[in-house]
């Protein structure tokens, strides 16, 4: 079964600041969650206006997922615990194209970066996504922040096109991913 | 649904080898580690060591180094355990599990019970 | 390797009951822990993977806590069904290792 979210645009308009945005356009009162009150608008398809839509408002879809790029500076756990709080998960990048999508959206804040669903426990054990899954180098390589202070990067963020591993308690950006079935 | 199914019961003798088969449902074999635990009669839980279904790589505890093998095929997805130079101490309830969130066990065979005896 | 000690060792409670068990490791390993059930002649459950977040499926009356060092897997209100062997396990480094368990049975 898919879960179908309903909104209707123009009922509530939200302050400046709410959202970091590339336009001055009002959006729809996420009605979620107040964890939803920090995320970025795109050009990809969003869930505002009158519509059925396998997403919650002001989430975009590309292909079967819908992508909540967070604003709120979180540590990875604490990420992790509000994209939980949302019903999805730290995104799991499955493809070349789904890597595509994403870098295409995070480009646009240069400045930021985002943590994903990939950490470890030590450098001596291997990646894993936040499913339990393995992941794959042939997908992307991750780009090692490590240094003689800082010895364990065990968490993951993108940053622009690269991907980095990164301290898991530094504040950082994020990104939830729900996946839907048809 | 998820399933991991697994051989019958063995008996074996001192030296001898055996061999346990997990076939993995109702998800994507290659994404997931397939752990292996073993339990003696009576006992707790014994990590013995995990296979990368996608790139066959093994990671095993030092103490079974030397005489476990673990092996996949992706076209059946099912995982396998073999151990040899078996001796008394070894018999108990082997079991493969499925890798879940944190590296922890979120789903299990119905275990393999091999007993080794004279 | 890192030793898991868990206490008590078993533990007699009547449905109703809190049951707390704890679980120590012997050198830190962040949230990389895991809680598992097990009933006799069967495979352990899955209840708690990092520390402290539930399993699906799991009935919320389980909770865990801890990191580090210490954790505490809690049962709120004990049910009939919840009397068997508890084992925590750490995923922090190579091997893999479990606690030696705690008995949970009917006072």
């Known amino acids: 079964t898919m879960a179908i979210w309903r909104s209707n645009s123009g009922s509530n308009t939200l302050e400046n600041g709410y959202f970091l945005s590339r336009n001055k356009e009002n959006h729809s009162q996420p009605t979620q969650s107040s964890l939803e009150d920090s995320v970025t608008p795109t050009k990809a398809v969003k869930t505002t206006g009158v519509l059925s839509s396998p997403c919650p408002p002001n989430w975009i879809i590309y292909e079967k997922s819908c992508y909540l790029f967070s604003m709120s500076l979180n540590s990875w756990d604490g990420s992790k615990r509000q994209c939980w709080q949302l019903g999805s998960n730290l995104l799991k990048i499955d493809s070349s194209n789904e890597l595509g999508f994403i870098v295409k959206q995070v480009s646009s804040q240069p400045d930021n970066s985002f943590w994903i669903g990939l950490s470890r426990p030590q450098t001596e054990v291997p990646w894993l996504w936040e499913d339990g899954s393995t992941f794959s180098s042939n997908l992307f390589q991750i780009r090692t922040t490590a240094t003689q202070e800082n010895p364990s990067p065990n968490c993951v963020w993108i940053h622009v096109s690269v991907i980095y591993d990164q301290l898991c308690s530094v504040p950082s950006y994020s990104i939830c991913e729900k996946k839907f079935s048809m | 649904q998820v399933q991991l199914v697994q051989s019958g019961a063995e008996v074996k003798k001192p030296g001898a080898s055996v061999k346990v088969s997990c076939k993995s449902s109702?998800?994507?074999?290659?994404?997931?580690?397939i752990h292996w635990v073993r339990q003696a009669p009576g006992q707790g839980l014994e990590w013995m060591g995990w296979?990368?279904?996608?790139?066959?790589?093994?990671n095993y505890a030092q103490k079974f180094q030397g005489r476990i093998t673990m092996t996949r095929d992706t076209s059946i997805s099912t995982a396998y355990l073999e151990l040899s130079r078996l001796r008394s101490d070894d018999t108990a309830v082997f079991y493969c599990a499925r890798n879940s969130g944190s590296y922890s066990f979120g789903y299990w065979g119905q275990g393999t019970l091999v007993t080794v005896s004279s | 390797d890192i030793q898991m000690t868990q206490s008590p060792s078993s533990v007699s409670a009547s449905v109703g009951d809190r049951v707390t068990i704890t679980c120590r490791a012997s050198?830190?390993?962040?949230?990389?822990l895991a809680w598992y059930q097990q009933k006799p002649g069967k495979a352990p459950k899955l209840l708690i993977f990092?520390?402290?977040s539930l399993q699906s499926g799991v009935p919320s009356r389980f909770s865990g806590s801890g990191s580090g060092t210490d954790f505490t897997l809690t049962v709120s209100s004990l049910q009939p069904e919840d009397f068997a062997t508890y084992y925590c396990?750490?995923?922090?480094?190579?091997?893999?290792?479990f606690g030696p368990g705690t008995k949970v049975d009917i006072e």
């Open positions: 109702g998800y994507t074999f290659t994404d997931y580690y």
């Open positions: 396990q750490q995923a922090f480094s190579f091997p893999f290792t």
């Open positions: 050198q830190g390993i962040s949230s990389w």
């Open positions: 990092g520390a402290s």
């Open positions: 296979i990368n279904p996608n790139s066959g790589d093994t």
